[in-house]
Interface confidence: low
């Protein structure tokens, strides 16, 4: 069915604790019609997580996200724009593990859902990791996204929505620069290979799908250093029918926390669109095998153009995501 | 345990160019950026560029456009920078440190480039 | 781009005292900031990023504070390893720029 511009498709039951700024990538705020009103943060490695707007932390990082995304319009960069009700932000994201998320397939009206959901074992594997919601549900692009570490999504543990691979399978958005207005923003789904880091100087002022985050608990952006060894986001996708839960719990136990729903809706004849470098703090690099998709900025529901076997992308994700 | 192997001292003339290797080893290779810093004697850090090991895409300091080049070599999971066009100013210990966010997680032990005739 | 400046080249410190070493953003750099520690012969070790998150095995001696365009990086109990160059770094945006580095001296 299609979700009209009041269904909520991404629902919050659990805020995840803080994120490390530098690993979000964008963030957006949930539908009105959610009744419990959330940020959805978008983490580099596309997890999403359940913010508490009214917390100082999340402010801090939306209004970072707004910064970089404004700092990289001016340097000719382009970031990802926010959608529906996002509004650009930097935040810090929190590697979180894939608990409960519902993609709702859309185009076709069916009520069929793709839901990634990590084991808590895998999810423990995992840097970092707090609440994170369906990927391409969030809207502004923040710091420079990792290739895809697989480790270095460090944020709240347990209360992760959803993380989108790096892989094929994992749903970006490319839209035009912040500057830019544009109604429809194109998912694009990360291939194993996280999108390339692009020359500023190169980038167009189009967006490109997030690079992955760190999963340390409390990176933040790319920072360099010896220290911890990366750490493999782990995180498994299930098909069912109906939305699906994200956990919030960022630095919290590893068990479902809040639940994120997000409606996917398969367009499978969408243009596949250009990938485009998405300025945002950060340059995040392309993904090379992209599911285009697009969503709508009205809603949060993510169209993404179905996928052949979703177990199949699903064991994809999941072996992407260990070492 | 995460380790960047980097190649050994060079010594070369100026005008010529050489290429520097960074091996990577106890992380997956493709997971994080592998960045390229300068160290000149005496003097701060500056960052060269990073590189997307999984397309190689790259990114670069526009100070050392044209003079460095970034490349990986997944299959090895090493990492090379080459320098062209060498003088004397590009004497300095080159360092290759992974990363995957905007600040770097591990170094390698620095390569030292000396440009004499 | 973004100038980092660290204002003192040289600090000179005592066992046991409490020492901050101060940078200077030219832009705020919304606390994308990350500290280094650099010892004679080695690579630099990240300490701080994100102006005071403390790296994975860094001594909880080690904090960073700060906002906007001024940062610092504390150390509250000075030890003998402490002696090194320290540089602070932003990871705002590209290019990512580091400070001229000050160097702690053990007296």
């Known amino acids: 069915q299609h979700h009209g511009v009041t269904k909520c498709n991404i629902t919050c039951s659990k805020m995840t604790s803080k994120i490390p700024v530098a690993l979000l990538i964008h963030y957006q705020q949930n539908q009105a019609s959610c009744g419990k009103r959330a940020i959805i943060l978008e983490t580099r490695q596309h997890r999403l997580f359940c913010a508490d707007p009214k917390e100082q932390w999340v402010k801090d990082a939306m209004q970072h996200l707004d910064r970089q995304a404004a700092a990289l319009t001016r340097n000719g960069g382009t970031f990802e724009k926010q959608i529906g009700e996002v509004k650009p932000r930097t935040t810090p994201a929190a590697g979180g593990m894939d608990e409960s998320v519902v993609l709702e397939p859309e185009a076709t009206g069916e009520s069929s859902s793709l839901e990634p959901t990590p084991s808590s074992q895998e999810a423990q594997r995992a840097l970092g990791t707090s609440p994170e919601l369906p990927t391409g549900v969030t809207g502004s692009s923040g710091t420079r996204l990792p290739p895809t570490p697989k480790a270095q999504d460090g944020g709240p543990v347990g209360t992760e929505l959803f993380r989108v691979p790096p892989v094929s399978t994992a749903a970006t958005w490319q839209s035009s620069a912040p500057h830019q207005p544009g109604p429809s923003l194109w998912a694009e789904a990360k291939t194993s290979e996280a999108p390339s880091t692009q020359d500023p100087s190169t980038q167009a002022s189009t967006a490109s799908s997030p690079a992955p985050e760190e999963n340390a608990p409390s990176e933040g952006q790319r920072v360099w250093g010896q220290g911890q060894s990366p750490r493999p986001e782990n995180s498994l996708e299930r098909e069912e029918m109906g939305p699906v839960p994200a956990h919030t719990d960022a630095f919290q136990d590893w068990g479902p926390g809040s639940m994120a729903h997000v409606s996917v809706v398969p367009v499978s004849s969408e243009g596949t669109p250009s990938r485009e470098p998405v300025a945002s703090g950060s340059w995040t690099p392309k993904a090379e095998e992209p599911i285009h998709a697009t969503m709508d900025p009205q809603r949060l529901g993510v169209l993404i153009t179905p996928v052949p076997d979703a177990q199949a992308a699903t064991r994809r994700q999941h072996h992407h995501h260990h070492h | 345990e995460v380790q960047l192997q980097q190649s050994g001292p060079e010594l070369v003339k100026p005008g010529a160019s050489v290429k520097i290797s960074c091996k990577a080893s106890g992380y997956t290779f493709t997971d994080y950026y592998m960045n390229w810093v300068k160290q000149s004697h005496g003097k701060s850090l500056e960052w060269i560029g990073d590189i997307n090991p999984n397309q190689g895409g790259t990114s670069y300091n526009q100070k050392f456009k044209g003079k460095a080049t970034l490349t990986v070599d997944k299959s090895s999971s090493t990492a090379y920078m080459e320098l062209r066009s060498l003088t004397s100013e590009d004497s300095a210990v080159y360092y290759c440190a992974s990363s995957g966010n905007s600040y770097v997680d591990y170094w390698g032990q620095g390569t030292t480039l000396t440009v004499s005739s | 781009d973004i100038v980092m400046t660290q204002s003192h080249k040289f600090m000179s410190t005592s066992v046991g005292d409490r020492v901050s070493i101060t940078c200077k953003a030219s832009?705020?750099?919304?606390?994308?900031v990350a500290w280094y520690q650099q010892k004679p012969g080695q690579s630099p070790k990240l300490l701080i990023y994100w102006a005071s998150t403390r790296h994975t095995g860094v001594p909880d001696r080690f904090t960073g504070s700060g906002s906007g365009t001024d940062y610092t990086l504390t150390i509250s109990s000075v030890q003998a390893e402490d002696l090194a160059l320290y540089y602070c770094?932003?990871?705002?945006?590209?290019?990512?720029?580091f400070g001229g580095g000050t160097k702690l001296e053990i007296k």
């Open positions: 770094q932003q990871h705002y945006s590209s290019p990512y720029t």
């Open positions: 832009q705020d750099v919304s606390t994308a």
